[in-house]
Amino acid sequence: LADPLDHRDAGDLWVPGESESFEDAHVEHSISRSLLEGEIPFPPTS
């Protein structure tokens, strides 16, 4: 399944002084997501 939360569409949202963290892209940059297979605590959200 394609992941609608893929971080690549976030663009360069971070600028100095900006307080929001890439719209919460932690899941896309998590250890779990990096494994890509097996049991992952952060499965792709449909």
């Epitope: 307080s19 929001e20 963290s21 919460d24 779990s32 990096s34 494994l35």
Partner: antibody, heavy 114, light 112 residues
Framework: EVQLVETGGSLVQPGGSLKLTCATS????????LHWIRRSPEKQLEWVAQ??????????YYAESVKGRFIVSRDDSKTTIYLQMNNLKEEDTAIYYC?????WGQGVMVTVSS | DVVLTQAPLSVSVTPGESASISCRSS???????????LYWYLQKPGMSPHLLIY???NLASGIPDRFSGSGSETDFTLKISEVEPEDVGVYYC?????????FGAGTKLELK
């Protein structure tokens, strides 16, 4: 098996320095954002620092309480992150965890006391 | 800073009964993409925290479905439908949307 192993904790005097190391294994490291989070003796969790990936120019972010004193860094070739802690204060006493927010290390104790 | 206020600070539950923990945020944690950046962790005695719920209502892998997360933009609830002895520990809510990232003060769950 995913592993995050923190080392380098000890007893240090106020004003002293310490460098924590978090050696990781079991996952592709380079694109992962990693954090240091600490748990105080009062059992409060406090986010300390974050380091993003090479694709994010290794951007770093800090809690106000440690800004200018702590430096987070990473070595992708060693799949390791670090926390250089300078000018330590008694209120820095805590268990320090390395985490990707999903997986956590076992933690390492840092005690700042004279 | 975003303040996360948890209630109660401690709860005593009979095994098999349900328990609910509340977490209130001082600001909305809803992003423009419809993601709610509210996470729940359990720290068992002598252990590291481990993830239960991410993005308000998503169950982390390996976590039994006795656990569920719900809420709005600022008010969140973790529910444990049938408490088991292994559920004892301190529960924390956290937000990873706004720097600095912050945690609630924790709710200690004990067994009656």
């Amino acid at each position: 098996e995913v592993q995050l192993v923190e080392t380098g904790g000890s007893l240090v005097q106020p004003g002293g320095s310490l460098k924590l190391t978090c050696a990781t294994s079991g996952f592709p490291f380079s694109n992962v954002w990693l954090h240091w989070i600490r748990r105080s003796p009062e059992k409060q969790l406090e986010w300390v620092a974050q380091i993003k990936a090479r694709s994010d120019n290794y951007a770093t972010y800090y809690a106000e309480s440690v800004k200018g004193r702590f430096i987070v860094s990473r070595d992708d070739s060693k799949t390791t992150i670090y926390l250089q802690m300078n000018n330590l204060k008694e209120e820095d006493t805590a268990i320090y965890y390395c985490t990707g927010l999903d997986y956590w290390g076992q933690g390492v104790m840092v005690t700042v006391s004279s | 800073d975003v303040v996360l206020t948890q209630a109660p600070l401690s709860v005593s539950v009979t095994p098999g009964e349900s328990a609910s923990i509340s977490c209130r945020s001082s600001r909305s944690l809803l992003t423009s993409k419809g993601i709610t950046s509210l996470y729940w962790y359990l720290q068992k005695p002598g252990m590291s925290p481990h993830l239960l719920i991410y993005r308000m209502s998503n169950l982390a892998s390996g976590i039994p479905d006795r656990f569920s997360g719900s809420g709005s933009e600022t008010d969140f609830t973790l529910k444990i439908s049938e408490v088991e002895p292994e559920d004892v520990g301190v529960y924390y809510c956290a937000q990873f949307l706004v720097y600095p990232y912050t945690f609630g003060a924790g709710t200690k769950l004990e067994l009656k």
